[in-house]
């Protein structure tokens, strides 16, 4: 039975040209995290495999930095980066857990971070 929960940074906003850290955390399970995939709608941003290291998709190579930890740093933000991001935790023996983050990239300097929330 899958007992874990994914905690994410939730709904977040950031300024155009700035950077943001996408972060998820898996809790309430003893399952081993073997890999974390980061996706945006229909494309892969990055994969962090516990053994094989990082894969960064070529579309994002210039402005995605691995980490901190299993997270992802997205740099040089544009308004086109607005949208849903997913962290997919591959675990053993539980299977996969998915977390969702909504990022809004703002033109102005009124960007504020949203509250953290949990997805079961």
């Amino acid at each position: 039975m899958m007992t874990g929960t994914i905690e994410t940074t939730g709904n977040i906003s950031a300024e155009k040209g700035g950077s943001i850290i996408l972060q998820c955390h898996l809790s309430s399970t003893t399952a081993q995290v073997t890999q974390v995939n980061w996706e945006q709608q229909d494309q892969l941003l990055a994969i962090c495999n516990a053994d094989l290291g990082w894969h960064i998709s070529p579309s994002f190579k210039d402005r995605v930095a691995p980490g901190p930890g299993l997270g992802l740093t997205l740099q040089s933000l544009t308004v086109n980066d607005t949208g849903e991001y997913f962290c997919i935790y591959h675990t053993y023996p539980d299977g996969t857990y998915t977390g969702r983050i909504f990022l809004e990239v703002l033109e102005s300097s009124v960007a504020e971070h949203g509250a953290r929330f949990q997805i079961p």
Partner: antibody, heavy 119, light 107 residues
Framework: QVQLVQSGAEVVKPGASVKVSCKTS????????MHWVRQAPGQRLEWMGG????????RNNQKFKGRVTITVDTSASTAYMELSSLRSEDTAVYYC????????????WGQGTLVTVSS | DIQMTQSPSSLSTSVGDRVTITCKAS??????VVWYQQKPGKAPKLLIY???YRYTGVPSRFSGSGSGTDFTFTISSLQPEDFATYYC?????????FGQGTKVEIK
């Protein structure tokens, strides 16, 4: 230029083990993950596992149920794949391949090593 | 494990023809797909990755597309040196898996 040079063909008996080497040159060995892929006669390619030479992190295909051991000697820029408890269906060409820096696509391959399991 | 199924398994065609190969994943693999070319007795060669980027030195007649579970590999105008077997492969999750291959033969 990047080169991956594998050890020569082997004929081994069922139940025995084989160890294939892959000597690399032309790049910084610890910066790229190394993989082993095999191909039985007329069959599709099959990923056996990979190793991150920087930290020894190792991920194997569970199909091989612990029969595969992948190691590296960083001082010699060489990767090794040992397959134990060999059976006839392990007869195949075994390839080493490296994946790119922060990229999982396997961009350079060894020439292949034919392993024949026969009594 | 994720199964990768290519179609067709083989095709007979002529120089100058357009060739399209499809690859279907048994579950979502996002854009984590690669295409290789293999000639008899030789190691595979990387052609396309992620799944629409041509590897260094690969001619522009080779292209790829797709996302999720459905992927396409195209040779816009087949050249004599293109007769070979082509494989798709996913690296979305381990174990990485390959399609069964598509053999492109001379008609």
């Amino acid at each position: 230029q990047v080169q991956l040079v594998q050890s020569g063909a082997e004929v081994v008996k069922p139940g025995a083990s084989v160890k294939v080497s892959c000597k690399t040159s032309g790049y910084t060995f610890t910066e790229n993950t190394m993989h082993w892929v095999r191909q039985a006669p007329g069959q599709r390619l099959e990923w056996m596992g990979g190793i991150n030479p920087q930290n020894g992190g190792n991920r194997n295909n569970q199909k091989f149920k612990g029969r595969v051991t992948i190691t590296v000697d960083t001082s010699a820029s060489t990767a090794y794949m040992e397959l134990s408890s060999l059976r006839s269906e392990d007869t195949a060409v075994y390839y080493c391949a490296r994946s790119g820096l922060r990229d999982y696509a396997m961009d350079y391959w060894g020439q292949g090593t034919l392993v024949t399991v026969s009594s | 494990d994720i199964q990768m199924t290519q179609s067709p398994s083989s095709l007979s065609t002529s120089v100058g023809d357009r060739v399209t190969i499809t690859c279907k994943a048994s579950q979502h693999v996002s854009t984590a797909v690669v295409w290789y070319q293999q000639k008899p007795g030789k190691a595979p060669k990387l052609l396309i990755y992620s799944p629409s980027y041509r590897y260094t030195g690969v001619p522009s007649r080779f292209s790829g597309s797709g996302s999720g579970t459905d992927f396409t590999f195209t040779i816009s105008s087949l050249q004599p040196e293109d007769f070979a077997t082509y494989y798709c492969q996913q690296h979305y999750s381990t174990p990485w898996t390959f399609g069964q291959g598509t053999k492109v033969e001379i008609k």
